[in-house]
């Protein structure tokens, strides 16, 4: 597999290996997004370790107010940190593709 | 660095590494995103590889209709694979992760 | 303090749209929290409307949503409810309130509320 | 929708009182169970947020427990500014829906 399709992989992976947890299934409820965040993107996380912090993050992911995180607001959330990386990468002239 | 990281690293290189060869180097031209679909996600592509066929790809994506698809855009494109990816996933029964 | 205060006619004819508008002072329209509208008729019982919160997400309650207009201006911390085609059944207190980011989102402030009669 | 049936009514108590009110779920809530208590003329206030956590400023004597589809709200002992209507909501799910209220009166 391509570099891309398997990063895609990872994303659908790391989804279920933690929502496979407690409750639905196929949701992250706070504790496992807590330890997703975690052990998963200890970048995007840094210091802020404390529970209100966690509960702001769940509630900015959780646009259905369902108390859980379903995998397209995963998605969304993962593109938002992405999206983020793309602004350092473009805003680096020494990471920045040739110019045209 | 984690695999989820890393697999956000990947979103992000590739997007550049086509990106930046021509016209705006921070969108995709047809061009660009055909050979970005082709050589990366050619697992999505299939057989489908007429001309017709990235017209319409190309169309889908380019939500602000400005004939170039940029970061934001491909982000959707890519969690709309990532949730094909996941629906497949969670129909598979020796995929699931355990019964909770 | 976190303060919320509701402005708009109190009396609206049937047919016609009602329109009210929240007032947050003491805090800012953060991503952090969700704005919402209720309100409570006159035999007290308590019906949520619907809220707007981050990245300008919206639900409404699926009850109104077809009459149902929310909206927020984040330079005058102020978030809007319209409701169209109002009969007598939408008299009520209309309530605006924030939405906590706890466990349960409790709705943990509330503006006084305005009474809103629609009569011709 | 889910619907949320309060118990009773309305009560009457006197000052000391042990004071329990009843909170039920059409379906299971979770946990995601908030209380209000709310004064003639007055805006609600939040007392309890999922099930028994304690909004700031509120006094211990409030106490809130359950699970599933069943829940309750306790006063260990009745206050003489408890005299009050208290709503039970749930944070479950949308649309968001509340109890029909207890009013708690003095005997």
């Known amino acids: 597999a391509r570099p891309l399709e398997e990063a895609l992989d990872v994303i659908v992976s790391t989804f279920h290996k933690y929502s496979g947890k407690e409750g639905d299934k196929f949701k992250l409820n706070k504790t496992e997004l807590k330890e997703l965040l975690t052990r998963e993107l200890p970048s995007f996380l840094g210091k802020r370790t404390d529970e209100a912090a966690f509960q702001k993050v769940m509630s900015n992911l959780d646009s259905n107010r369902d108390n859980e995180v379903d995998f397209q607001e995963y998605c969304v959330f993962l593109s938002c940190i992405a999206m983020m990386c793309n602004e350092f990468f473009e805003g680096c002239p020494d990471k920045e593709p040739r110019k045209k | 660095a984690r695999p989820l990281e890393e697999a956000l690293d990947v979103i992000v290189s590739t997007f550049h590494k086509y990106s930046g060869k021509e016209g705006d180097k921070f969108k995709l031209n047809k061009t660009e995103l055909k050979e970005l679909l082709t050589r990366e996600l050619p697992s999505f592509l299939g057989k489908r590889t007429d001309e017709a066929a990235f017209q319409k790809v190309m169309s889908n994506l380019d939500s602000n209709r400005d004939n170039e698809v940029d970061f934001q855009e491909y982000c959707v494109f890519l969690s709309c694979i990532a949730m094909m990816c996941n629906e497949f996933f969670e129909g598979c029964p020796d995929k699931e992760p355990r019964k909770k | 303090q976190v303060q919320l205060q509701e402005s708009g006619p109190g009396l609206v004819k049937p047919s016609q749209t009602l329109s009210l508008t929240c007032t947050v002072s003491?805090?800012?329209?953060?991503?952090?929290?969700?704005w919402n509208w209720i309100r409570q008729f006159p035999g007290k019982g308590l019906e949520w409307i619907g809220h707007?919160?981050?990245?300008?997400?919206?639900n409404y309650n699926p009850s109104l949503k077809n009459r149902l207009s929310m909206s927020r201006d984040t330079s005058k911390n102020q978030f809007s409810l319209k409701l169209s085609s109002v009969t007598a059944a939408d008299t009520a207190v209309y309530y605006c309130?924030?939405?906590?980011?706890?466990?349960?989102?409790?709705?943990?402030?509330w503006g006084q509320g305005t009474l809103v009669t629609v009569s011709s | 929708d889910i619907q949320m049936t309060q118990s009773p009514s309305s009560l009457s108590a006197s000052v000391g009182d042990r004071v329990t009110i009843t909170c039920r779920a059409s379906q299971d809530i979770r946990n995601y169970l908030n209380w209000y208590q709310q004064k003639p003329g007055k805006a609600p206030k939040l007392l309890l947020y999922?099930?028994?956590r304690l909004h700031s400023g509120v006094p211990s004597r409030f106490s809130g427990s359950g699970s599933g589809t069943d829940y309750t709200l306790t006063i260990s002992s009745l206050q003489p500014e408890d005299f009050a209507t208290y709503y039970c909501?749930?944070?479950?799910?949308?649309?968001?829906?509340f109890g029909g209220g207890t009013k708690v009166e003095i005997k």
């Open positions: 999922y099930t028994s």
């Open positions: 707007i919160g981050y990245g300008g997400n919206i």
């Open positions: 003491g805090d800012s329209f953060t991503n952090d929290y969700y």
């Open positions: 909501q749930q944070g479950n799910s949308l649309p968001r829906t």
């Open positions: 309130t924030r939405e906590s980011f706890y466990d349960g989102y409790p709705f943990d402030y």
